[in-house]
């Protein structure tokens, strides 16, 4: 219920806020969920708790897992869960879906791109901005506080924008990057029956027990701004929110605009620590708009170990 997905890259700083709210004066205790072991508050540790924040300075792939925070208010102990995944740095320029923050849309009049999660960090201006991994240069781009402003936005300004900044903790510096898609609103548009791009209907995905896996539900609904366009995952025909399994979390739907100008939305289902029982579930990708509902089903199967024959 009070669970939040957070992700980062190895060797970068990652700071996570407890999903349970409370006043800054409240004591917050953090634990490793699996072991119930308390996370230290001493800053000399690489991973330490600081009130409502959990800090990985820097993060390692092995830090991935579920963390429990307990906010001790005068009335209740409010429990929340932070589902943290640390990924290896990508060797190429491509930023995979699972590292993307929510998409923002811009137009000629409003072209602000905020750097995601930056408010959690102790950073100083200026931010560095990249588009599709290329450093942004030219007078059209203005890095202002925690956002980027693009003058005279054009359709080819759409793409993936990465902000890079330095987090300072007690004199030590740590790099942080965050990427989100930027789409340019097209005034001319239309709506049509949803087309699911992924997964294919009745697809089977091979997974390894104990590993993490992501399922992307991606659908397109027409061109331009859409009045109603939603994608979501269901488990055995039930909403994710009704399926009380903290290992399985659905990201908020993220808007995307492809080169063909189609308005698409995708949502990622993150499954942590895949278990045998997950293979028995039916995973439905649902796409809905005013024209109707389309459903594609995917199932998980165990990845067969490669036979080593002499």
């Amino acid at each position: 219920k009070f669970s939040k997905q957070s992700w980062g890259l190895e060797n970068e700083a990652l700071i996570v806020r407890c999903p349970r709210q409370g006043k800054s004066s409240y004591i917050v205790d953090w634990y490793y969920s699996q072991t119930n072991k308390s996370i230290p508050t001493q800053e000399r540790n690489r991973v330490f708790a600081s009130g409502q924040l959990l800090k990985f300075l820097p993060a390692e792939v092995a830090d991935s897992g579920i963390y429990t925070c307990i906010v001790r208010s005068p009335t209740f102990n409010r429990t929340g869960y932070a589902n943290v995944t640390i990924y290896k740095k990508q060797p190429d320029c491509n930023v995979p879906d699972y590292l993307m923050y929510s998409t923002v849309s811009g137009s000629e009049k409003n072209s602000k791109i905020y750097c995601p999660t930056i408010d959690l960090y102790n950073w100083t201006a200026p931010l560095e901005w990249f588009k599709n991994c290329q450093a942004l240069q030219g007078s059209r781009y203005k890095a202002h506080k925690s956002f980027l402003v693009i003058d005279n936005v054009m359709t080819d300004d759409a793409g993936d924008y990465t902000c890079k900044f330095i987090h300072n903790e007690n004199g030590a510096n740590y790099s942080v990057t965050a990427t989100r898609s930027f789409t340019v609103k097209d005034e001319q548009g239309f709506s049509r029956f949803p087309v699911i791009r992924a997964p294919a209907h009745n697809e089977t995905k091979e997974v390894e027990i104990g590993e993490n896996t992501n399922l992307t539900c991606s659908a397109c609904f027409g061109k331009g701004a859409q009045f109603l366009a939603a994608v979501q995952w269901q488990l055995n025909g039930n909403k994710i929110t009704d399926f009380s399994e903290p290992r399985i979390q659905q990201e908020e739907g993220q808007n995307q605009s492809f080169s063909d100008g189609l308005a698409c939305v995708n949502t990622v289902l993150r499954i942590a620590d895949v278990k045998e029982e997950d293979l028995l579930l039916r995973y439905d990708c649902l796409a809905l708009n005013l024209h109707g509902l389309r459903r594609h089903t995917i199932r998980l199967s165990r990845k067969n170990p490669i036979d080593h024959q002499s």
Epitope: K1, K23, S25, S73, T75, N77
Partner: antibody, heavy 119, light 106 residues
């Protein structure tokens, strides 16, 4: 919009019990604590206790332990307060109140239930 | 229990006048909330976290204080401000309220 609809006025005999209800609408019931407050001309506003509808956890003012029992029904988004062994000093106006979970203050109040204990 | 003492119990003011009411806590609290109640109505959130105005509260209201001493000030009283104002602490269980300051207009 957020609404807390409390049950109607009650007239009960001393020694009896009564259950007051508070139906929530306009928000996700399980995301916010529900608190109960008593108001009388003599003692003013007194905090009775609270319930976390998601977990069923409760917290009480020591003064009202044994007097008030708080419950919540997630399916109907309704909070309940049972008052037992009623006496004349339990005659009061009772409020159910939602709490703003960012700042911990009472952001939405029910319209009140007046309880009169009299033989 | 933390006892909150509000003063004065009754405050009489003329429209346009500046008024201040205080709330003293028997031990230190981190912040104070204030509520406004008019006869026959439920209390309404007025000021939260010592100094933040709740939604719809006119800018002539302000709150301040720390530790054991807090206050609510109205820079220029208007007729609609006539009500009882309660302070409330959330720093320890049980949560407690002050007895209220009743603001009357002359």
């Amino acid at each position: 919009q957020v609404q807390l609809q409390q049950s109607g006025a009650e007239l009960v005999r001393p020694g009896a019990s009564v259950t007051l209800s508070c139906k929530a609408s306009g928000y996700t019931f399980t995301d916010y604590e529900m608190h109960w407050v008593k108001q009388t001309p003599v003692l003013g506003l007194e905090w009775i206790g609270a319930i976390d509808p998601e977990t069923g956890d409760t917290a009480y003012n020591q003064k009202f332990k044994g007097k008030a029992t708080l419950t919540a029904d997630k399916s109907s988004s309704t909070a309940y307060m049972e008052l037992s062994s009623l006496a004349s000093e339990d005659s009061a106006v009772y409020y159910c109140i939602r709490v703003d979970s960012n700042y911990d203050y009472f952001d939405y109040w029910g319209q009140d239930t007046t309880l009169t204990v009299s033989s | 229990d933390i006892v909150l003492t509000q003063s004065p119990p009754i405050l009489s003011a003329s429209p346009g006048e500046k008024v201040t009411m205080t709330c003293r806590a028997s031990s230190s609290v981190s912040y104070m909330h204030w509520y406004q109640q008019k006869p026959g109505s439920s209390p309404k959130p007025w000021i939260y976290d010592t100094s933040n105005l709740a939604s719809g509260v006119p800018a002539r209201f302000s709150g301040s204080g720390s530790g054991t001493s807090y206050s609510l000030t109205i820079s220029r009283v208007e007729a609609e401000d006539a009500a009882t104002y309660y302070c409330q602490q959330w720093s320890s269980n049980p949560l407690t309220f002050g007895a209220g300051t009743k603001l009357e207009l002359k």
